[in-house]
């Protein structure tokens, strides 16, 4: 039996889009199906359709096809956003160039090479002919458009409206002439969909006939649209996987653009390793801002919309996501991939005319020897020799004094989060410095994340009396109040310290907050005897990108039957998959008559790979995140629970393994929760507790 060809490669996909017909005369046809491929096959073959199919929409929610005799360029039609819809348009009808002899060309050019208007195919005036639309079904002999129904040598042609000229070819360019690229085409985002030998490209979102790793959702910045040629991996030029099972991949024939956009006057001196002047000529590949946050691609509008695109600034080399200075700013910069931080300067790039020492660090920066002497919050570092006593207090070996010169940022204690320094400010004894890891350095700061090498529990003593959970064993749960209302959860990890989330502090005025401990009811009803209300004296923000905050209480909590601390895990530990854990919170429950009592949801630990699959590959987890899925569909953390803990038990010991942070949806069915991995930040937490002064009880 002949294998039916998969025709979805012949369509251009527009995700989350549908077409709405404004003209009621336009027909559509619908049917329930399982996949978009089925819709495509039927559209291509026009099987059972009362019109020539030019596009279709696949409704993922209803598993339904909507076939159209029109596309987004047709009149009487408008595009509309819709989460559940994907629009597929037959490329032949929207392409304005030809492939090979142009047999598949179905565009709307209707003028010949010498400028004569074409005669309609259904007309016999001025020229009689046998090319009737009814005789050439599927060849789209519509209106008076140029066509090549027999695949003849000269390309698309038509009978002309001039009685003296029977027929003439049309001047439609080859797609390979229209398409062009700059450099090696890493930033090429054109519509070439066949290789240099004419093989049709395989869709990037398909795994047949060739399995591959370049999934569009895993690499959203690589432009993996439909089956267009791309260069995601630094090849000499764009390429694609092919539909030929015997040819895995092939290069595409895309010519280099004739670059006449460069203005010879006022061209800045190009540098790759350092900045000259304001860095307008910097052409290096640093692609993070000063604090290590990766840059957004210049050709992307997510997470930040902007007009600094390669198209608008052609001679500014806005490739990939490299730091550049296209607008005369004070130094190279970029939009960041952090939705909360729009732009940042790449101030870690050294100045050409100023030996600045190293301006980035490798691994965790313990060998960093640069000259930076300022913290991320702008405080000037204080001299190491004035702080040796404090340093000895929290490290158990003799630091290398030869490295601790002046007041430069260093990492004498093997801190996982990079170089730091003392500040001389009694409120902020030390902080991290705004230096990022060296470009290309991928050394993990914790190894073997998915292998349970280090146990998370410190000891093996029994923690729950007789194994009966009572009210007292949630004594570490904190209700953070903002202007007298519950806003977030938190975990009491030491008498004076609460671990919570950065987003829980809308105001910078600490008088707006207080911490309630020892309560079961969010309003404190019936908890009068056990409730402790404490003011907040300081917020210590976690390492860049952590979303963590250590909240210092104005006085230590009194530990009793109702208030207790919860243990931290060992640094870098891994909890085994399927370990049963719980999240606690006073947040949104989905119930109208919520009683205000502390709730618990039971989750189980899921490996990062598996977790990513459950998120349909849209989320790549890193070593600072931990994932847990619900045992009960649709249960999990939500608004009001943020800052609260993911608590797991190992060797009969309960620990806070994760912190609930916003941004991952609210208890979405079949989507496991992603939490901040406390084990990754455990050393930072211990260091803060050890070095920051707290009031005595």
């Amino acid at each position: 039996q002949r294998k039916r060809r998969n025709t979805i490669h012949e369509f251009k996909k527009s995700a989350k889009t549908t077409l709405i017909k404004i003209d009621p005369a336009l027909k559509i046809k619908t049917k329930k199906v399982n996949t978009a491929d089925q819709c495509a096959n039927r559209c291509t073959r026009n099987k059972g359709l009362p019109f020539t199919c030019k596009a279709f929409v696949f409704d993922k929610a209803r598993k339904q096809c909507l076939w159209f005799p029109f596309n987004s360029m047709s009149s009487g039609v408008k595009k509309e956003f819709g989460h559940e819809f994907d629009l597929y348009e037959n490329k032949d009808y929207i392409r304005n160039c030809i492939i090979g002899k142009g047999r598949s060309y179905k565009g709307t050019v209707s003028i010949t090479k010498s400028g004569i208007k074409c005669q309609p195919w259904s007309s016999m005036i001025p020229h009689e002919h046998s090319f009737l639309p009814s005789s050439y079904r599927g060849k789209d002999l519509q209106e008076n458009y140029c066509r090549n129904p027999r695949g003849e040598e000269g390309g698309p042609w038509c009978f002309t409206s001039n009685p003296e000229v029977r027929y003439e070819v049309c001047d439609i360019p080859q797609c390979s002439e229209v398409e062009c690229m700059t450099c090696n085409g890493e930033s090429y985002r054109g519509l070439m969909d066949h290789t240099e030998s004419g093989k049709i490209c395989q869709r990037w979102d398909h795994q047949t006939p060739h399995r591959h790793k370049f999934l569009p959702e895993r690499y959203p910045d690589k432009g993996f649209d439909d089956n267009y040629c791309r260069n995601p991996d630094g090849q000499p030029r764009p390429w694609c996987y092919t539909l030929d099972p015997h040819t895995r991949w092939e290069y595409c024939a895309i010519k280099t653009c004739a670059d006449n956009t460069m203005n010879d006057t006022d061209v800045p001196l190009e540098t790759t390793e350092c900045i000259q002047g304001q860095g307008e000529g910097y052409r290096g590949t640093v692609n993070t801002i000063w604090n290590g946050i990766p840059c957004q691609r210049w050709d992307s509008q997510y997470p930040h919309e902007h007009d600094m695109t390669p198209e608008n600034f052609k001679c500014k080399d806005l490739r990939e996501n490299y730091c550049r200075n296209p607008d005369g700013s004070e130094s190279p910069w970029c939009f960041t991939t952090d939705p909360n931080i729009r732009v940042g300067y790449c101030s870690q790039i050294p100045n050409c005319d100023m030996s600045h020492g190293q301006d980035c660090y490798r691994g965790n920066g313990k060998n960093y020897m640069g000259n930076l002497s300022q913290t991320r919050s702008g405080l000037t570092c204080s001299m190491w020799d004035k702080n040796m006593e404090d340093l000895h207090r929290h490290i158990f070996w003799e630091p290398d004094a030869s490295k601790l010169n002046e007041n430069y940022c260093r990492n004498p204690d093997d801190d996982a989060h990079g170089p730091w320094c003392y500040t001389g400010n009694p409120l902020i004894p030390w902080d991290y410095c705004p230096i990022s890891r060296c470009e290309g350095d991928t050394t993990p700061t914790i190894v073997n994340l998915d292998h349970p090498v280090i146990s998370c529990a410190k000891t093996k003593q029994l923690r729950v009396v007789n194994g009966i959970p009572t009210r007292t064993n949630i004594g570490w749960m904190v209700s953070l109040r903002y202007r007298n209302k519950h806003i977030c959860g938190g975990s009491l990890i030491k008498e004076s310290w609460v671990l919570t989330a950065r987003q829980c502090f809308p105001s910078r005025d600490l008088k707006d907050y207080e911490a309630w401990l020892g309560i079961h009811d969010v309003h404190g009803r019936g908890d009068e005897k056990c409730k402790q209300v404490l003011n907040v004296s300081q917020l210590v923000y976690g390492p860049e990108g952590s979303d963590l905050v250590l909240m210092k209480l104005a006085r230590p909590a009194v530990l009793d039957d109702f208030v207790s601390t919860i243990d931290l895990p060992n640094y870098g530990c891994t909890i085994p998959e399927k370990t049963s854990c719980s999240v606690y919170g006073w947040g949104y429950t989905g119930l109208i008559n919520y009683d205000g009592l502390l709730r618990v949801a039971h989750l189980y630990i899921m490996g990062n790979e598996k977790c990513s699959q459950h998120h349909r590959g849209k989320v790549t987890l890193n070593e600072s995140e931990i994932c847990a899925g619900a045992e009960k569909i649709g249960s999990g953390p939500c608004e009001g629970d943020y800052g609260g803990p993911l608590v797991c038990e190992q060797h009969k010991m309960r620990m806070v393994l994760g912190v609930i942070v916003p941004g991952r949806g609210c208890a979405i069915p079949n989507r496991p929760g992603i939490f901040v991995r406390v084990a990754y930040y455990a050393k930072w937490i211990h260091k803060i507790i050890l070095t920051y002064k707290v009031p005595q009880s």
Epitope: H304, R502, Q503
Partner: antibody
Framework: SVEESGGRLVTPGTPLTLTCTVS????????MSWVRQAPEKGLEWIAV?????ATDYASWAKGRFTISRTSTTVDLRIPSPTTEDTATYFC?????????????WGPGTLVTVSS | AYDMTQTPASVEVAVGGTVTIKCQAS??????LAWYQQKPGQPPKLLIY???KLASGVPSRFKGSGSGTEFTLTISGVECADAATYYC????????????FGGGTEVVVK
Amino acid sequence: SVEESGGRLVTPGTPLTLTCTVSGFSLSAYAMSWVRQAPEKGLEWIAVIYVIGATDYASWAKGRFTISRTSTTVDLRIPSPTTEDTATYFCARVYDSVWNHFNLWGPGTLVTVSS
Amino acid sequence: AYDMTQTPASVEVAVGGTVTIKCQASQSISSWLAWYQQKPGQPPKLLIYQASKLASGVPSRFKGSGSGTEFTLTISGVECADAATYYCQQAYSVSNVDNAFGGGTEVVVK
């Protein structure tokens, strides 16, 4: 981008809901705010909704307005408008998940309250 | 409350001149202050944030300074395009705030 809608001519006391539709960024990363401007007057901050779902209102706006959100929209409900509520209402994105400056504004939607 | 007072309400300046606008907070807001420019029929445009940081695409003739309770916006080498109303906004806290914005300063360019 952000775009306001729902502004129209209403009579005093007729409830009105203004909607701010966002695209190109996620409401799980940014706080959102409503600001208004009466004809020939200055900017007047009304309310903010933070990433964690908490809300804040200007002291004069408490009880007079309600801010809420879905995954892609932020609403401002005016349960009982008065003639003093005639203004252009702007939706603005806060440059953070918490209170900060506004780095993205909508074009505004005009509300006219008149009997 | 963290309320903002802006002065003057209006100022006239010649092309090429310098204009100074002041903004006072009712209590200390550290450096959490932003400045906006608004032209008729348009939404406000961010100029300065964190008291002195220039927003992307804003010309360097705009300069912000100050901390605590006293802040200043200075426009030097004024151009015709700078004719607009300027507002300050505190980005510190909205606890019991009447208005996060100052009353505005109209800059008229002669």
